[in-house]
């Protein structure tokens, strides 16, 4: 099923590209390119039976582009308004600039501390996690070896079992592997909440009748860690995905040789077993520092915040993140909006049907309409 | 839980051909092999073939090539088999069973086929 | 293909007592060999594989044991509920082949 993230994704790769280049260079690719790339999404999905996929991209693609040209009308408005917002409160929180920046430092170590234990656990989990991958899938090559040196008269009733049992292996073992290691990134979503709360309570008494900028500074904040973290979880997956498609290939490797010669079947078994382990061993070397580096990243967007409140801030691009929150937010109460009508519609008649199509209609161009306004 | 839900009984006449269907739930489908088993009345078990979800493979028993074939669709979780050229000898009792680690830890409920004119 | 031989069609036992059902493999099978418990109207349970590996949650009443081409299946203390068919089959060569099954029944 098509996701609201896969879309606010597709649609804010988007409009970060056309940020990047010459606006007017593309304008008029805009409203076609952003239809195929949503489009895209919907490929596979529309052989199925159920017309969900189908409803839901006649009124997301109008949805979807609408929405992006008021994303790039309002980019630059929501650009001064954030400034604008930033030197409020900056003004209000300059008297108390060095407490301000050392309960942000406290804040920090704070957030340091609660995630080492989590970086560490997730660099354990992945050597342990990759060492376990090793152990199970070794037998398999083992056994066929063992086989092959037994030299059973037929070969090839005798090891294909193996070989099947290995491929199927391969895939289950990168499944637990990443059910594994995703939920850190799970946990880390806590700590973050967690840490801003504390560092929302411990600015307050600063903030006074600013608090609505302060609240809306640490909510940007919070989007932009917690977006670290779904990103650690996607290249955790990632590469849990690369290691499955690196492991496949052996054990075709195995079953293509069964119909050729005991040579270089031979061979391959031989192999096996180090491939196994090479390719296993390159992905615990890979995957390994992801935890710290998360942490580095968190840590940089903390210190960003406080030089941003700070007295020397300098021009910051902080708009972007706000603009794709928006986003995001607009296309997830798109997607449960849309979700909510589906499951009624079931038990509408037709009459009521037409007559709810008409005001959902209605409802979309309100939804795009409603660009958060800004607390000012 | 593992579950594998299989398709109701068939009374089909001889010559036709007939689709058997086993939904699975609790479990990633596409990375396990479904097996399918045969049993006629009153007697074993005799193994047909496997196939795997994720990429489409297929194992065949030499002896049913030709009889049996087997499909399976993601997204519905659910794997077919096909019988064709049916006689009464077909008529059985056949059952899904997924493979894990070699032998089949979870099966189907069983589907009657009987096979008359 | 690999025959699985299992030469009690039917077996007579008391609640309490101790079965032993045997199994026979036409050529070496090492110990790829599983055991199945089939009971009337059902489908068939995995009991053993491995030749001597329960499988979870399989009381430890069954045991299985063998290697090579003999291969057994014990259940001990038998209960009403173990009335059943039971089955061996192999996993080291394709086809994989079953045994055509022993029938318990309780006296």
């Known amino acids: 099923e098509v996701s609201a993230d896969q879309v606010a994704t597709v649609m804010w790769d988007y409009f970060s590209q056309l940020s990047n280049n010459a606006k007017e260079a593309v304008e008029h690719l805009q409203k076609s390119e952003l239809t195929q790339q949503l489009n895209a999404l919907f490929q596979d999905k529309l052989g199925e039976v159920n017309t969900y996929a189908g409803d839901l991209q006649k009124k997301l693609v109008p949805f979807a582009t609408e929405l992006h040209e008021r994303l790039a009308k309002d980019s630059e408005k929501l650009k001064e308004e954030i400034g604008k917002e930033l030197e409020e409160l900056r003004a209000r929180l300059l008297p108390h600039a060095n407490e301000v920046s050392q309960k942000i430092g406290d804040n920090l170590r704070e957030l340091q501390q609660r995630l080492e234990p989590y970086a560490d656990q997730l660099r354990t989990q992945v050597s342990t996690q990759a060492e376990q991958l090793r152990r199970q899938l070794t037998p398999y090559a083992q056994r066929m070896e063992r086989v092959l040196r037994e030299n059973a008269d037929s070969l090839q009733a005798s090891l294909r079992p193996h070989a099947d049992e290995l491929k199927a292996k391969i895939d289950q073992n990168v499944e637990e592997l990443k059910g594994r290691l995703t939920p850190y990134a799970d946990e880390f979503k806590v700590k973050i909440d967690q840490t801003v709360e504390e560092l929302r309570r411990s600015l307050a008494p600063y903030a006074q009748d600013t608090q609505e900028k302060l609240n809306h500074q640490l909510e940007g904040l919070t989007f932009q860690m917690k977006k670290n973290a779904e990103e650690l979880k996607a290249r955790i997956s990632a590469s849990a995905e690369e290691l499955r498609q690196r492991l496949a290939p052996l054990a075709e490797d195995v079953r293509g040789n069964l119909r050729g010669n005991t040579e270089g079947l031979q061979k391959s078994l031989a192999e096996l077993g180090g491939h196994l382990d090479q390719q296993v061993e390159e992905f615990r070397r890979r995957v390994e520092p992801y935890g710290e580096n998360f942490n580095k990243a968190l840590v940089q967007q903390m210190e960003q915040l406080r030089q941003k409140l700070g007295p020397h801030a300098g021009d910051v691009e902080g708009h972007l993140s706000f603009l794709e929150k928006d986003l995001r937010d607009k296309v997830n109460s798109f997607f449960s909006t849309f979700k909510e009508k589906e499951s009624q519609d079931k038990t509408l008649s037709l009459p009521e049907l037409e007559q709810q199509q008409e005001q959902q209609q209605e409802q979309q161009q309100e939804q795009v309409q409603m660009l958060a306004p800004l607390e000012s | 839980q593992v579950h594998l839900q299989q398709s109701g009984a068939e009374l089909v006449r001889p010559g036709s051909s007939v689709k058997i269907s086993c939904k699975a739930s609790?479990?990633?489908?596409?990375?396990?092999?479904m097996n399918w088993v045969r049993q006629r009345p009153g007697q074993g078990l005799e193994w047909i073939g496997q196939?795997?979800?994720?990429?489409?493979?297929?194992t065949y028993n030499g002896k049913f090539k030709g009889k049996a074939t087997l499909t399976a669709d993601k997204s519905s979780n659910t794997a077919y088999m096909h019988l064709s050229s049916l006689t009464s000898e077909d008529s059985a009792v056949f059952f899904c069973?997924?493979?894990?680690?070699?032998?089949?830890?979870?099966w189907g409920q069983g589907t009657t086929l009987t096979v008359s004119s | 293909d690999i025959v699985m031989t299992q030469s009690h069609k039917l077996m007579s036992t008391s609640v309490g007592d101790r079965v032993s059902i045997t199994c026979k493999a036409s050529?070496?099978?090492?110990?790829?060999v599983a055991w199945y418990q089939q009971k009337p109207g059902q489908s068939p349970k995995l009991l053993i594989y491995?030749?001597?590996t329960r499988h979870t949650g399989v009381p430890d009443r069954f045991t299985g044991s063998g290697s090579g081409t003999d291969f057994t299946l014990t259940i001990y203390n038998v209960q009403s509920e173990d009335l059943a068919d039971y089955f061996c089959?192999?996993?080291?060569?394709?086809?994989?082949?079953f045994g055509s099954g022993t029938k318990l029944e309780i006296k």
């Open positions: 069973a997924r493979r894990g680690d070699y032998v089949y830890d979870y």
């Open positions: 609790g479990y990633a489908f596409s990375i396990y092999w």
């Open positions: 196939i795997y979800p994720g990429d489409g493979d297929t």
């Open positions: 050529q070496d099978v090492g110990t790829a």
């Open positions: 491995w030749a001597s």
């Open positions: 089959q192999q996993y080291s060569t394709y086809p994989f082949t």
